[in-house]
Interface confidence: low
């Protein structure tokens, strides 16, 4: 199709070579007067559309993305051509940074239903550069955490080294929706709830004498609870003795609850005490059986192929540990009577 009628937008992605980061392009279709696809509700200057970008189709996946090869070859369909670029509804996700992402990206509706729709497309010229500004050593991360229940803020990585006074007007999006009131390089959250989690995009305009560009950065925001102040607790076994049948196989399960830690290195292991000797047992891998915002329950089993008389003299000890401390629970086997 002829892309000469597409509206054009220039974007700049300056990525940090120190961190993994993502990037997004929105299919921000314009408003031809008679196109149902690109139609936007008529808004007074004070109103804000519910969705920006792309409000036309009921099904937001009804757009097609293409890349325009620099050598003049025909347009290439993004869906099949680029493994690190994923289309999610009307958004194009770039999963890895790199100058090879530079180029022209075109989006348009999949279904052309009227002659007016033919020109209903956007051409985005994306320039990708590695960050060279070494003076800003502590620029905000592209992965930011907010502590639930407290005050927090989300900083625009490309502007975090500028003071609020110097900062240009910023346009923020959360999960593809315009955050209309936010205009500064930092979003302040009075009280953090789990719904503050998501993908935030900050845009600002940079101009030179020739043209203007939209500088964009993407921030993945995670809402977290504070690191636990407690050592893990053992939920099972509860009893310190266990009735068993000699000669039969036996599985003893150790289940422990670990509180949330940002750097999470849980330890859960079984060892055996026999008079003065003590040794760790080779047992199946631990597995997480429940994971919530605040804690994780991890289980690890010890398996005896056959309970022997010797096992009755031993203590089976489950040991669990996090960065705060450790807990143990021992089990003595007792032969079942009659």
């Amino acid at each position: 199709f002829n892309i000469s009628g597409c509206s054009t937008k220039k974007l700049l992605w300056t990525y940090s070579t120190r961190s993994e980061e993502e990037f997004v392009l929105f299919c921000d279709l314009p408003e031809p007067q008679k196109s149902h696809f690109c139609h936007r509700n008529r808004l007074s200057p004070k109103q804000v559309p519910e969705h920006l970008p792309f409000m036309g189709s009921n099904d937001l996946s009804d757009v097609q993305w293409y890349q325009q090869p620099s050598n003049g070859d025909p347009l290439e369909d993004i869906r099949k051509s680029y493994p690190h670029i994923i289309q999610d509804k009307c958004t194009l996700h770039f999963l890895t940074p790199g100058v090879n992402n530079s180029g022209s990206y075109i989006c348009r509706p999949k279904m052309i239903k009227s002659p007016y729709d033919v020109a209903c497309c956007v051409k985005m010229i994306l320039e990708v550069k590695p960050q060279t500004n070494a003076s800003c050593e502590y620029s905000a991360s592209h992965k930011q955490d907010l502590l639930l229940g407290s005050t927090g803020s989300i900083s625009c990585p490309s502007l975090s080294c500028q003071s609020d006074a110097q900062s240009p007007a910023v346009t923020w999006y959360k999960n593809g929706k315009l955050l209309s009131v936010e205009r500064s390089n930092r979003i302040v959250v009075d009280e953090v709830y789990d719904y503050h989690q998501g993908t935030y995009v900050c845009d600002y305009t940079q101009s030179d004498t020739v043209s203007s560009w939209t500088v964009r950065a993407v921030v993945q925001v995670r809402t977290i609870v504070g690191d636990t102040k407690l050592k893990p607790d053992i939920l099972d076994p509860v009893e310190d003795t266990l009735e068993v049948e000699l000669g039969k196989p036996l599985t003893i399960s150790c289940k422990a609850r670990f509180g949330f830690e940002r750097v999470f290195n849980p330890v859960i292991k079984w060892y055996i005490k026999d008079s003065d000797l003590e040794w760790e047992v080779s047992v199946p891998e631990a597995k997480s059986i429940k994971s919530t915002l605040k804690d994780e329950i991890i289980e690890r089993n010890i398996i005896l192929e056959k309970v022997t008389q010797r096992d009755l003299r031993r203590k089976f000890v489950c040991f669990v540990q996090n960065s705060i401390g450790n807990t143990t629970q021992s089990v003595q086997l007792k032969e079942k009577r009659g």
């Epitope: 290439e76 369909d77 869906r79 099949k80 051509s81 680029y82 493994p83 690190h84 994923i86 999610d88 996700h93 999963l95």
Partner: antibody, heavy 118, light 111 residues
Framework: SVEESGGRLVTPGTPLTLTCTVS????????MTWVRQAPGKGLEWIGI?????NTYYASWAKGRFTISKTSTTVDLKITSPTTEDTATYFC????????????????WGPGTLVTVSL | AAVLTQTPSPVSAAVGGTVSISCQSS????????LSWFQQKPGQPPKLLIY???TLASGVPSRFRGSGSGTQFTLTISDVQCDDAATYYC???????????FGGGTEVVVK
């Protein structure tokens, strides 16, 4: 490498989850598919989970299977198995080739056998 | 859903000879070429032979050749070896992922 586990004998209607454990590569970079093969029959494509966790299923498999993943595993849940679901279930990595534009199942696990019987 | 119909099984081939297996799709595969071929031996997982209708996968001998476009594809094995005795499957990738499918398979018997 890719390895499936969790296959066993189940009764009809008992949900079963198969796990595909990967090593040597990251699930952040590859899509993963599930394929099955009934005894003595051909291969059937079940579905794929891509790098941003979007799942796509063969039209016959929608509602019957659920694919999900963690950082190193991909699960296939058979929601309500019937005797027709008796098969070897394979997990395969979807590779992308730079010189073409499509995904192909290049690395396969040995498979895990599921038997659904009363 | 798309249906991929393969040459009926079994197909016989003599050592040193040539064998061709066809695969017909009920609709065009994506970009007319997103079709791959696999070889499977009993008790083993499938092995990728060809992707993109005609590109040879890494480590596959050049005796295997893929051709075709759109809805009609062929796998040709020349200078057939005993080790080529297996079942061969085609697999189509379509613009809608829910259409992706395998063919029914063709068993090649080497005499």
């Amino acid at each position: 490498s890719v390895e499936e586990s969790g296959g066993r004998l189940v009764t009809p209607g008992t949900p079963l989850t198969l796990t595909c454990t990967v090593s040597g590569f990251s699930l952040n970079n590859y899509g993963m598919t599930w394929v099955r093969q009934a005894p003595g029959k051909g291969l059937e494509w079940i579905g794929i989970i891509n790098i941003i966790d979007n799942t796509y299923y063969a039209s016959w498999a929608k509602g019957r299977f659920t694919i999900s993943k963690t950082s190193t595993t991909v699960d296939l849940k058979i929601t309500s198995p019937t005797t027709e679901d008796t098969a070897t279930y394979f997990c395969a990595r979807a590779d992308y080739y730079p010189d073409t534009t499509g995904w192909y199942l290049n690395i396969w696990g040995p498979g895990t056998l599921v038997t659904v019987s009363l | 859903a798309a249906v991929l119909t393969q040459t009926p099984s079994p197909v016989s081939a003599a050592v040193g000879g040539t064998v061709s297996i066809s695969c017909q799709s009920s609709k065009s595969v994506y970009n007319n070429k997103w079709l791959s071929w696999f070889q499977q031996k009993p008790g083993q997982p499938p092995k990728l032979l060809i992707y993109g209708a005609f590109t040879l996968a890494s480590g596959v001998p050049s005796r295997f050749r893929g051709s075709g476009s759109g809805t009609q594809f062929t796998l040709t094995i020349s200078d057939v070896q005993c080790d080529d005795a297996a079942t061969y499957y085609c697999a189509g990738d379509y613009s809608s992922n829910s259409d992706d499918a395998f063919g029914g398979g063709t068993e090649v018997v080497v005499k």
